[in-house]
Interface confidence: low
């Protein structure tokens, strides 16, 4: 589709005459009629097949045509044509008298003919006029011509459509040739794919406007090239989505299990060597002088109570030394001057002789210990709780106050790991020195039975395009990780060309 | 067949609610943009809402705007018109069509689901 | 907003060429669509991109799109062609449509 566009600039007519030779009365008022037609090796008249224009008359025997396009187009005169420009054409200008404004055929004198001409040749499409000048016996005609392009066609025949657009289904301008020329941050064949932030990750990242970098799922980041932990990951990392990678020291499906207690919290004091002993668990190995749990405690020579029958302990540089109270004698106030005729024994103890009436044993009652039952019991002294458990006297009874991870009247069980039922769809969960191990149901599999093994949601291969399928263990749902080029939930649009809808 | 069966039409209150759907079948339901055009009684066409072939681009008319809701469900093939606050002025034939990959032209129509909205 | 304009009725002897116009600023720079609507009918697309004919639509229909006007004729005008034409393009992200001219085949 274009236009021939013939611009007519100056008609000699000197004399004021017809083809005929009459002269005009009173001048010939000369009006033009154009056709244009394909190339005829001899022009003759016929069918203007590729259009015919007139003009109004536009002045009298000789005149200037003056370049009117700016108020109303009559000149240059327009000859559009709705095909391709075959390159070659042939063009026929009359000039004829109309003594009256009725400029139709049949209200023209007969011979108002004031010249004709005619001309063929090849002519490009292009934006240069040609300027020719045709005389004949009594008439010169000087004009230019050329062929242009309409709105939207390009090209060497005016034959290619482009219609600029900058919408949902098309960012671009067009050149010359007819070819797309993307705008700005644009590309793809009809320039609908965006370019992407600068960096952003052809596989993981995509975008639906010019400099952004959407995440598809599993990724996160800028750049989209962050992988995204497997949901409640705490102490692990990931190289492709939702894995947890444990860091060192830590273990468990979501790397929460802490393997490295000693490491990560530094429990023993005073120099002590720590050892891990499970999850959450470790015992420390005092120095010398020093005790405790964590050997927070520094050794006094009087705590272990080395004295006997209710003496006195005191601390010396050199060790300890006991005072004994009055009938008792010795390094610990072990012996004793007394009889059970000086009723040795306190609290209501009962008093039994010995060699003879040389010595003497206090039968304590309930509560009470000691030689001479001058001592309440402390059910705590001999350290009951297993596990670095910290006694507490209760009366006449004894309580364990368990550190984390313990339980059981002594301390001595270790916490089910199996308490908070980890094992999912049913496992049976299995205590072990170092942890638990769980024994799956028919049709699961993993760590915690958390793999559907029948039910695989990427069993089916439901990712087009050779996209990678991740199974999300949490929902039982797949995701498609597309290739560069695909998208969709399953990856199977081609980017570059999706259903096009291309207003 | 290529074939869009519209159904949900019917008389409803001023301010009330309806969903329109339109099955498909006879084509490649998801690759193709779709469209809801509606005829008012003795009027012509007015469009109202179209969505791409993705659900990820719907464009509507002014005069429905926050009103109604266009969306899709490519695993059943069908395409929906969710329409709320009715008003009278809404009463129309109201066409599912499938728009030509390609090209500007509606290439498919459905039989159309007649909304009768009374005040 | 933009408006396509369209006569309201265009009549036309059998055999007749009919041509139907729709009017917008610069519609030659868009695409043009033309539907026929019988009564009680659903719409038919029988022209699209200003010129191009859906197959099944016969050859008596054509189309043109420059300037403000697209045009569709149809030539050697047969009674059932007589119907509602309605033109339709886009603007911006919506679709518009004529107002509709009704053909009678006199």
């Known amino acids: 589709s274009g236009v021939f566009q013939l611009q007519l600039q100056e008609f000699i007519n000197e004399r004021g005459v017809l083809a005929s030779g009459r002269p005009c009365e009173p001048g010939c008022r000369t009006f033009f009629r154009v056709c244009l037609k394909h190339f005829q090796a001899v022009v003759s008249p016929g069918p203007c097949t590729f259009g015919t224009v007139s003009t109004p008359v536009l002045g009298t025997n000789s005149f200037a045509v003056r370049d009117d396009s700016s108020g109303g187009g009559r000149n240059p005169l327009q000859l559009p044509f709705n095909f391709t420009w075959p390159g070659t054409f042939s063009l026929i200008i009359e000039a004829w008298h109309a003594p009256g404004d009725d400029l139709r055929p049949e209200a023209l004198p007969p011979d108002a003919l004031i010249s004709k001409i005619a001309i063929q040749g090849s002519l490009a499409v292009g934006q240069n006029w040609l300027l020719d000048e045709q005389t004949s016996t009594l008439t010169r005609l000087r004009y230019s011509y050329r062929v242009i392009c309409s709105d939207n066609y390009y090209g060497d025949n005016c034959s290619r459509l482009c219609k600029k657009r900058n919408d949902h289904f098309g960012h671009y301008v067009c050149q010359p040739d007819g070819n797309l020329s993307c705008l700005p941050g644009w590309t793809g064949e009809y320039c609908q794919q965006p370019i992407c932030l600068s960096g952003c990750h052809e596989q993981n990242g995509y975008c639906s406007k010019p400099a952004e970098c959407l995440c598809r799922p599993g990724w996160q980041g800028r750049l989209c090239n962050e992988c995204i932990p497997h949901n409640g990951c705490r102490h692990g990392t990931c190289s492709t989505p939702w894995q947890c990678t444990c860091d060192e020291g830590w273990g468990g499906l979501f790397c929460d299990q802490d393997l490295n207690y000693c490491t990560h919290h530094s429990p023993c004091k005073n120099g002590a060597t720590c050892s891990n002993s499970g999850q959450r668990s470790y015992t420390c190995t005092c120095r010398p002088g020093y005790t405790g749990v964590d050997c927070e405690l520094e050794l006094s020579e009087c705590d272990s109570n080395p004295c006997r029958n209710g003496g006195s302990c005191k601390d010396q540089e050199d060790g300890y030394h006991c005072l004994c109270p009055p009938g008792y004698y010795g390094l610990h106030c072990e012996h004793s001057t007394l009889s059970c005729a000086d009723s040795p024994c306190f609290n209501g103890g009962s008093c039994r002789e010995r060699n003879q009436g040389a010595n003497y044993a206090c039968e304590c009652p309930p509560n009470f210990t000691g030689s001479n039952c001058e001592k309440k019991v402390d059910r705590c002294t001999s350290n009951p709780c297993a596990n670095g458990g910290q006694c507490l006297n209760r009366g006449p009874s004894r309580m364990c106050r368990c550190r984390p991870g313990f339980t059981g009247t002594y301390c001595e069980l270790h916490v089910s790991d199996c308490a908070r039922n980890p094992c999912a769809h049913g496992g049976t969960c299995h205590d072990l020195e170092n942890g638990l191990m769980c024994t799956c149901p028919a049709g699961f599999s993993g760590r915690r039975c958390e793999v559907r093994t029948s039910i695989d949601a990427c069993a089916s291969s439901p990712c087009f395009n050779r996209a990678t399928c991740y199974t999300d263990l949490s929902t039982d749902t797949f995701v498609c990780n597309c290739p560069y080029g695909f998208v969709g939930s399953r990856c199977e649009f081609p980017v570059g060309l999706p259903p096009s809808f291309p207003w | 067949e290529v074939q869009l069966v519209e159904s949900g039409g019917g008389l409803v209150k001023s301010g009330g609610s309806l969903r329109l759907s339109c099955a498909a079948s006879?084509?490649?339901?998801?690759?193709?943009?779709m469209s809801w055009v509606r005829q008012a009684p003795g009027k012509g066409l007015e469009w109202v809402a179209i969505?791409?072939?993705?659900?990820?681009?719907?464009y509507s008319a002014d005069s429905v705007k926050g009103r109604f809701t266009i969306s899709r469900d490519n695993s059943k093939n069908t395409l929906y018109l969710q329409l709320n606050s009715l008003r009278a002025e809404d009463t129309a034939v109201y066409y599912c069509a499938k728009a030509g990959g390609g090209n500007v032209g509606f290439d498919i129509w459905g039989q159309g689901t007649m909304v009768t909205v009374s005040s | 907003s933009y408006e396509l304009t369209q006569p309201p009725s265009v009549s036309v002897s059998p055999g007749q060429t009919a041509s139907i116009t729709c009017s917008a600023d610069k519609l030659g720079t868009k695409y043009v669509s033309w539907y026929q609507q019988k009564p009680g009918q659903s719409p038919v697309l029988v022209i699209y991109?200003?010129?191009k004919r859906p197959s099944g639509i016969p050859e008596r229909f054509s189309g043109s799109n420059s300037g403000n006007t697209a045009t569709l004729t149809i030539s050697g005008t047969q009674t059932m062609d007589e119907a509602d034409y309605l033109c339709?393009?886009?603007?911006?992200?919506?679709?518009?449509f004529g107002g509709g001219t009704k053909l009678t085949v006199l």
């Open positions: 339709q393009s886009w603007d911006r992200s919506d679709v518009v």
């Open positions: 006879g084509f490649t339901f998801r690759s193709h943009w």
């Open positions: 991109q200003d010129a």
């Open positions: 969505i791409s072939y993705d659900g990820s681009n719907k």
